[in-house]
């Protein structure tokens, strides 16, 4: 053999009970002691430190703390050094060293030692991870190393968590004993934080010890708090709230169109939008996630705003007889009432739509002019003007005529046309054509679709010529012999000699 000792590195017992520290030792065979003596020391293996003597086989002298409380259960001659300590109090917790005394100089304190832990609560062992919906085994374990007092276990607060299974007395690796009771159940999220207790009672004594453990049930997030759809006026402040219940707390993420706007590990998370714009209108998603699962919910944010200035697309130049299609569109929330006016006359209107189509089949020159597209909702009104230009062949209006005054003849040719026509005055009797470009004879003035050309002929009043007005543009030509106003009413009078 060799010098060596075997005892549990740690052992525990309840305050007020006792503990048997199992111990075996060995020594070299050649020492052959006639009698084997032994000493148990408390907290130090070094005799020079004067450690308290727990037990000494040569004498009955022990430290006052161990007076009447220590007894050797083992037979040292059989190399069994098992020690019994009774009426345990907290100050007896610590290291216990055995010293073999074989006589002569062979006194050997073994480095192997037992650490005694004096406890007053049962040990409830909960698995490191308790997940909702997955069966779990919780055990209550108490030391059973006192031969004189045996513990009885019972569970506290286990109602609804299943019936306990008592395993009874089990031997641990290092020779110590424990009483074990098991509880099998499937935890729910509601069981999180539940206080589960175990009681160790010693029959025929007043000794009773209780221990508690709070269940830390892990479960996936459920979003429990979320705005329903939100309406906000452009420029206002919006706060979206997402709250989730989970363990551990979730990572909450606010997203829009796949983009993360804000995230934090928290039970609730606000998304603050300052001075909202229509661009922020849309669907916002809150994602709650932890290691055990995820949940997501969406909220629609409606940003209310006045219509934008309408835009007009379509034909703004048309040829007489063509069909004209004009689209007026805007953006607003809610959708607007759209109206197209011409000279205060409503030509088309739609309610709660963002665009309005105006169709003019076979346009006439009367359709030419300024139009207004007006968009309106409860937040405001915007309008856009547009011009429709109808192109047509010249029309010489009937108000065109010639008139004489003193010695001058003035011919007025009023032409309605688009685009602007050329105008010429023809005097067939003289075989003369006067164009508008001849500024000394012709004065032209354009007003809208009307072109007024005036031909002035001096010294022609006595015998005014025939005058034909001809107007021409790319769509056609029209000629009209201009009537001489008041010819039938001409009065000649000669005054004087």
């Amino acid at each position: 053999g060799h010098w060596g000792a075997w005892m549990p590195s740690s052992i525990s017992a309840f305050e007020g009970t006792c503990v048997s520290i199992p111990c075996r030792f060995d020594f070299p065979d050649e020492l052959r002691p006639a009698v084997v003596h032994g000493v148990w020391y408390f907290n130090s293996p070094y005799p020079k430190n004067y450690p308290p003597v727990v037990f000494k086989s040569r004498t009955q002298v022990v430290h006052e703390s161990f007076q009447g409380r220590s007894r050797l259960l083992g037979d040292l001659g059989l190399r069994n050094c098992t020690l019994l300590l009774s009426t345990l109090s907290p100050e007896l917790g610590g290291k216990y060293y055995f010293r073999g005394d074989l006589g002569g100089y062979n006194q050997y304190t073994f480095s192997e030692h037992s650490v005694l832990d004096i406890i007053n609560t049962p040990n409830i062992v909960v698995p490191p991870e308790v997940v909702a919906g997955t069966e779990v085994e919780v055990s209550c374990m108490v030391p059973d190393n006192c031969p004189e007092l045996r513990p009885e276990l019972s569970w506290l607060g286990h109602e609804g968590l299943g019936e306990p299974t008592v395993l009874g007395r089990l031997r641990e690796d290092e020779g110590t004993w424990v009483q074990v009771s098991l509880l099998h159940f499937v935890p729910t999220r509601e069981a999180n934080g539940h206080r589960l207790g175990c009681q160790a009672a010693f029959p025929n004594t007043t000794l009773q010890f209780e221990g508690y453990a709070s269940l830390d049930v892990k479960y996936p997030p459920v979003i429990v708090e979320m705005n329903s759809s939100v309406e906000a006026i452009e420029g206002s402040h919006v706060s979206l709230l997402c709250g989730a219940d989970s363990n551990p707390p979730p990572l909450l993420t606010w997203m829009r169109d796949g983009m993360v706007l804000r995230e934090a590990v928290a039970e609730s998370l606000y998304l603050d939008l300052e001075e909202v714009t229509p661009a922020e209108d849309g669907i916002y998603a809150c994602l709650a996630e932890n290691a055990y699962g995820q949940d997501n919910r969406t909220v629609e944010l409606s940003v209310m705003y006045a219509p934008w200035k309408p835009t007009v697309n379509g034909t703004v130049v048309a040829v007489e007889g063509e069909t004209v299609s004009i689209l007026c569109s805007t953006q607003s929330n809610p959708d607007p009432i759209l109206t197209i006016f011409k000279e205060k006359q409503i030509l088309a209107t739609v309610i709660y739509e963002s665009q309005l189509q105006l169709e003019l089949p076979a346009v006439t020159p009367e359709d030419d002019g300024e139009y207004w597209c007006v968009a309106e909702n409860q937040y405001g009104q915007r309008a856009t003007a547009f011009n429709l230009s109808v192109e047509f062949a010249p029309i010489i209006l009937l108000e065109s005529h010639c008139a004489a005054a003193r010695d001058t003849v003035q011919c007025l040719c009023v032409v309605k046309s688009n685009p602007e026509p050329s105008v010429a005055f023809e005097l067939p009797s003289r075989n003369v054509t006067v164009n508008e470009t001849e500024r000394e004879f012709v004065y032209s003035e354009r007003s809208g679709l009307l072109l007024t050309s005036i031909l002035t002929l001096r010294g022609q009043a006595q015998a005014p010529p025939r005058v034909i007005c001809t107007s021409r543009n790319l769509y056609g030509t029209q000629s009209l012999e201009l009537p001489f106003q008041g010819a039938h009413r001409l009065m000649w009078a000669k005054i004087g000699p």
Epitope: H2, L31, Y105
Partner: antibody, heavy 126, light 112 residues
Framework: QVQLVQSGSELKKPGASVKVSCKAS????????MNWVRQAPGQGLEWMGW????????TYADDFTGRFVFSLDTSVSTAYLQISSLKAEDTATYFC???????????????????WGQGTLVTVSS | DIVMTQSPDSLAVSLGERATINCKSS????????????LAWYQQKPGQPPKLLIY???TRESGVPDRFSGSGSGTDFTLTISSLHTEDVAVYYC????????FGQGTKLEIK
């Protein structure tokens, strides 16, 4: 130099007690164990036991338990052997002898007795 | 206890001659832990305390003449005085200090 000086011879009646002293000098008293050895007239040597001079812990050989007590006064570097209830067969020369011993660690390793006192003759006679 | 037996009980040797004393232990005094023999030899002259000559079976104590030597292992040991001097006349004891300490009965060495 190392010296162990023992008290003088004693003549005692049976039933009496005797206390033999052994004063050490020339070394650190508490660094060595002190042994006691008995030699009856014309006989061999008998080891009685030893005392740990640091802790004061005595160890007695099996034949020397009960009436024999080892003690110390470290302040004067002196070891004592007290024998009570003296018997005629206790008549002998008693030697003290030191031995270097590794008792600073947790385990004592024996070393031989290297220095001896001159001996004290105790005679028990009526 | 370990019993130590010396032989012879007494021995007469001429001056300058070799003297050999044997010692046998009832059990081995070789300590397995350090492979040392826990055996010593003492010399005791009349009216004096024993004087250490040899320890660990073969290690000579300082100041001891080199004519003294020790040998052996386990259970059989020998003290040898290579050349006897007048002052070597004494009783010699073997001593084991492995287990509870014991001495041999002694060997008386005289001059022939």
């Amino acid at each position: 130099q190392v010296q162990l000086v023992q008290s003088g011879s004693e003549l005692k009646k049976p039933g009496a007690s005797v206390k033999v002293s052994c004063k050490a000098s020339g070394y650190t008293f508490t660094n060595y164990g002190m042994n006691w050895v008995r030699q009856a007239p014309g006989q061999g040597l008998e080891w009685m036991g030893w005392i740990n001079t640091y802790t004061g812990e005595p160890t007695y050989a099996d034949d020397f338990t009960g009436r024999f007590v080892f003690s110390l006064d470290t302040s004067v570097s002196t070891a004592y052997l007290q024998i009570s209830s003296l018997k005629a067969e206790d008549t002998a020369t008693y030697f003290c002898a030191r031995n270097p011993i590794n008792y600073y660690g947790i385990n004592y390793e024996g070393y031989v007795m290297d220095y001896w006192g001159q001996g004290t003759l105790v005679t028990v006679s009526s | 206890d370990i019993v130590m037996t010396q032989s012879p009980d007494s021995l007469a040797v001429s001056l300058g001659e070799r003297a050999t004393i044997n010692c046998k232990s009832s059990h081995s005094v070789l300590y397995s832990s350090n492979q040392k023999n826990y055996l010593a030899w003492y010399q005791q002259k009349p009216g004096q305390p024993p004087k250490l000559l040899i320890y660990w079976a073969s290690t000579r104590e300082s100041g001891v003449p080199d004519r003294f030597s020790g040998s052996g292992s386990g259970t059989d040991f020998t003290l040898t005085i290579s050349s006897l001097h007048t002052e070597d006349v004494a009783v010699y004891y073997c001593h084991q200090y492995l287990s509870s300490l014991t001495f041999g009965q002694g060997t008386k060495l005289e001059i022939k």
